[in-house]
């Protein structure tokens, strides 16, 4: 990075002073500063000297020294103030041109930093700035009007307070040009249209731009339509609107409609589709399977997609049984509209209870009639198990009943010792019952199965365990005989524990 002598970032001198600014670099260096009189420039190898022996207020400005050969592109700067009591401002340009929303720098440089506290920006002839003019001041650069607007295209003066009076700079003309950011903005409404043959329809194509010079047209299946245009100007934008009114639609009106607008920046287009139908329609569908299985205590959302024209006149969710006559709470039913002709209806069933299994039907109605979509909801339960001792055909038998959904599988275990649950180390014998007898199997209910284990002699100090499992979980019941030779005693002489 080059180095400037004197070694200060800013310098205050009086008019008529001799000022010598020296820049030293590793290679050749170059000075860049405001265009002003009286400077002489001479180079001496790796240094360059900018000198004046008669500094004036016009020499006020920032002088930057760069090293063209430096790959890092480093530079050093020094700001020179030539404080002239008669000239508080050095104006570097009398016309500034920016685009809207850019910052506009009005380059009036203060010649004496002491005056900074009393500076302000005014319009010519002492008129105040327009409301909402947001500006800031830098003694090195001047006034910046932030995010300039077209309406701020005015003549400005910089004002400094000197000895109690305001001293103005020469005027600076600001020209704020409208930005044409691209092709005009477009809207085409509706985004989709359905009508029954013979009904009326309206399609509106509108375009807007900051500049009046743009064209807009509406086309149907690549044919440009001759439609009268309405023009307007508001919110600082020009608008052109084309409205297509159809009193009685027919099938030839159906198809693709495109709204196209163009200006010097290019072209924008947007499309919609118009469908003409013979009669009203109402279609119900679901992305879900209509047969649902959910574990008891969990939640489920049932979703129905509705496609309809004309709009729905009524809809509701109904519980069709078999457990109770309760109906879904309205607060659990939710409707969302995807677009004009498609809707999604959701029924939320949180923490499902046994009595909530069964059929749920969504019904909807429009002028085309009624439609219904029915879901069948079966609840899954982990097995519940119980074991009793009984005699069947004179043989001592352990009878295990297991109830759950899906249908449980049954396994018998015999193990040593008295225990609530057999562990691997204690197991003496294992019997799988691949086909337990189904006692009950009704829709939406648990399946109850029964498994029999014939035991000639109930061994003392042993445990008989019935285990049942399904996809939800498992359950077990341990049967513990109390006395030896129990096979000769009736069942009530034995204790069984779950």
């Amino acid at each position: 990075i080059p180095v400037i002598e004197p070694s200060v970032p800013e310098l205050v001198v009086k008019p008529g002073a001799t000022v010598t600014l020296r820049c030293v670099g590793n290679g050749s260096v170059e000075w860049d500063g405001p265009p002003s009189p009286h400077w002489t420039l001479y180079s001496d190898g790796s240094s360059s000297i900018l000198s004046t022996n008669n500094a004036t207020f016009q020499n006020t400005g920032t002088y930057r020294c760069t090293e063209p050969g430096d790959p890092l592109g480093g530079s050093a700067a020094i700001h020179l103030y030539v404080k002239d009591p008669a000239r508080p401002w050095n104006v570097l340009a009398q016309e500034v041109v920016v685009f809207e929303d850019q910052d506009a720098l009005l380059p009036c440089l203060l010649t004496d930093p002491v005056l900074e506290a009393g500076v302000s920006l005014v319009r010519v002839r002492g008129r105040p700035l327009m409301r909402h003019t947001n500006y800031s001041f830098s003694p090195w650069h001047g006034f910046t009007i932030h995010r300039a607007k077209f309406i701020q295209s005015q003549d400005y003066q910089c004002s400094a307070l000197m000895g109690g009076r305001k001293v103005m700079s020469i005027s600076i003309r600001l020209k704020v040009q409208k930005v044409i950011p691209g092709p005009p903005a477009l809207t085409l409404v509706p985004a989709e249209l359905v009508r029954i043959r013979g009904e009326a329809a309206q399609i509106v194509c509108s375009a807007s731009s900051v500049d009046v010079n743009f064209d807009v047209f509406l086309q149907h299946n690549n044919t440009k339509l001759a439609i009268p245009q309405q023009s307007d100007f508001h919110n600082n934008r020009y608008q052109k609107v084309l409205t297509l009114n159809l009193d009685q639609v027919d099938f030839q009106h159906a198809g693709n409609y495109s709204c196209v607008a163009s200006n010097v920046q290019g072209k924008h287009s947007t499309s919609m589709f118009f469908r003409v139908v013979e009669s009203a329609y109402l279609n119900l569908s679901s992305e879900q399977n209509l047969i649902q299985e959910v574990t008891v205590g969990e939640g489920l959302n049932l979703k129905v997609m509705v496609e309809a024209y004309p709009g729905l006149q009524g809809f509701n969710w109904t519980y069709l049984g078999p457990f109770s006559d309760h109906q879904p709470e309205p607060k659990l039913a939710n409707a969302t509209t995807k677009d004009t002709y498609r809707h999604t209806f959701t029924l939320s069933l949180p923490r499902l209870k046994p009595s909530e299994a069964g059929r749920y039907s969504f019904l909807a109605r429009n002028p085309g009639g009624w439609r219904a979509l029915t879901f069948e909801l079966t609840l899954r339960y982990p097995p519940e198990v119980s074991v009793i001792w009984t005699f069947i055909n004179g043989s001592g038998t352990l009878l295990c009943a297991a109830s759950g959904y899906p249908q449980p599988n049954v396994t018998w275990l015999q193990c040593s010792g008295h225990t609530d649950r057999c562990d691997e180390a204690q197991v003496l014998q294992v019997w799988d019952d691949p086909y337990p007898e189904v006692l009950s199997q009704e829709p939406f209910h648990k399946v109850t199965v029964q498994s029999l284990l014939t035991v000639e002699t109930l061994e003392h100090n042993q445990t008989y365990e019935c285990r049942a499992h399904n996809s939800v979980g498992s359950g077990s019941w341990a049967f513990i005989p109390i006395s030896a030779g129990a096979h000769t005693h009736p069942p009530d002489e034995f204790l069984f524990t779950p």
């Epitope: 002598e5 004197p6 200060v8 970032p9 310098l11 930093p113 900074e116």
Partner: antibody
Framework: QVQLQESGPGLVKPSETLSLTCTVS????????WTWIRQPPGKGLEWIGY???????NYNPSLKSRVTISVDTSKNQFSLKLSSVTAADTAVYYC??????WGQGTLVTVSS | DIQMTQSPSTLSASVGDRVTITCRAS??????LAWYQQKPGKAPKLLIY???SLESGVPSRFSGSGSGTEFTLTISSLQPDDFATYYC????????FGQGTKVEIK
């Protein structure tokens, strides 16, 4: 009228970092440039460095490896940090705007 | 580094005297020199900048001259308030101060 006021600990242990703050009143720190200068007891003045409101800095080459000057425009303050101090850093430390307005100075003693 | 040498180190003078202090730079510093006055326990006060420009509010009995390597500070008629230590400072390449000149009552 611009006024400057130095603040910070009066005693710093050897090898630690000396930290001072200069608060500017009666003017904005977002203009001009801001300097630190020191004066050992009974001796002459030594320039430490300066910072311009834009953030650019310039330091005395003999102190450069140990010095950091920074500016906080929101508080209208600038500060000095001098690391790895020794007894030779004992001095009255002045802050100044350029070289026209000076603070009254604060004595910092480096001692264990 | 640029060295600044002031002479004399001490100067005895009376009220009304014309006093001259010299400052010599080890290499050319153009006109980038300032003069300060410091009283005991106080901060230095800027008198002259750019070798000869009088700081506003400083009495006109103070003047500066010189360029390149030789500079002088002159007090045309010494006043009681002027007894103090005076420092020169170059700001051409980094900043360095002279060792100071003490002006005391004769």
């Amino acid at each position: 009228q611009v006024q400057l006021q130095e603040s910070g600990p009066g005693l710093v242990k050897p090898s630690e970092t000396l930290s001072l703050t200069c608060t500017v009143s009666g003017g904005s720190i977002s203009s001009s440039y801001w300097t630190w200068i020191r004066q050992p007891p009974g001796k002459g003045l030594e320039w430490i460095g300066y910072i311009h409101y834009s953030g650019s800095t310039n330091y005395n080459p003999s102190l450069k490896s140990r010095v950091t000057i920074s500016v906080d425009t929101s508080k209208n303050q600038f500060s000095l940090k001098l690391s790895s101090v020794t007894a030779a850093d004992t001095a009255v430390y002045y802050c100044a705007r350029g070289f026209d307005y000076w603070g009254q100075g604060t004595l910092v003693t480096v001692s264990s | 580094d640029i060295q600044m040498t002031q002479s004399p180190s001490t100067l005895s003078a009376s009220v009304g005297d014309r006093v001259t202090i010299t400052c010599r730079a080890s290499q050319s510093i153009s006109s980038w020199l300032a003069w300060y006055q410091q009283k005991p326990g106080k901060a230095p006060k800027l008198l002259i900048y750019m070798a000869s420009s009088l700081e506003s509010g400083v009495p006109s009995r103070f003047s500066g001259s010189g360029s390149g390597t030789e500079f002088t500070l002159t007090i045309s008629s010494l006043q009681p308030d002027d007894f103090a230590t005076y420092y020169c400072q170059q700001y051409n390449s980094y900043w360095t101060f002279g060792q100071g000149t003490k002006v005391e009552i004769k």
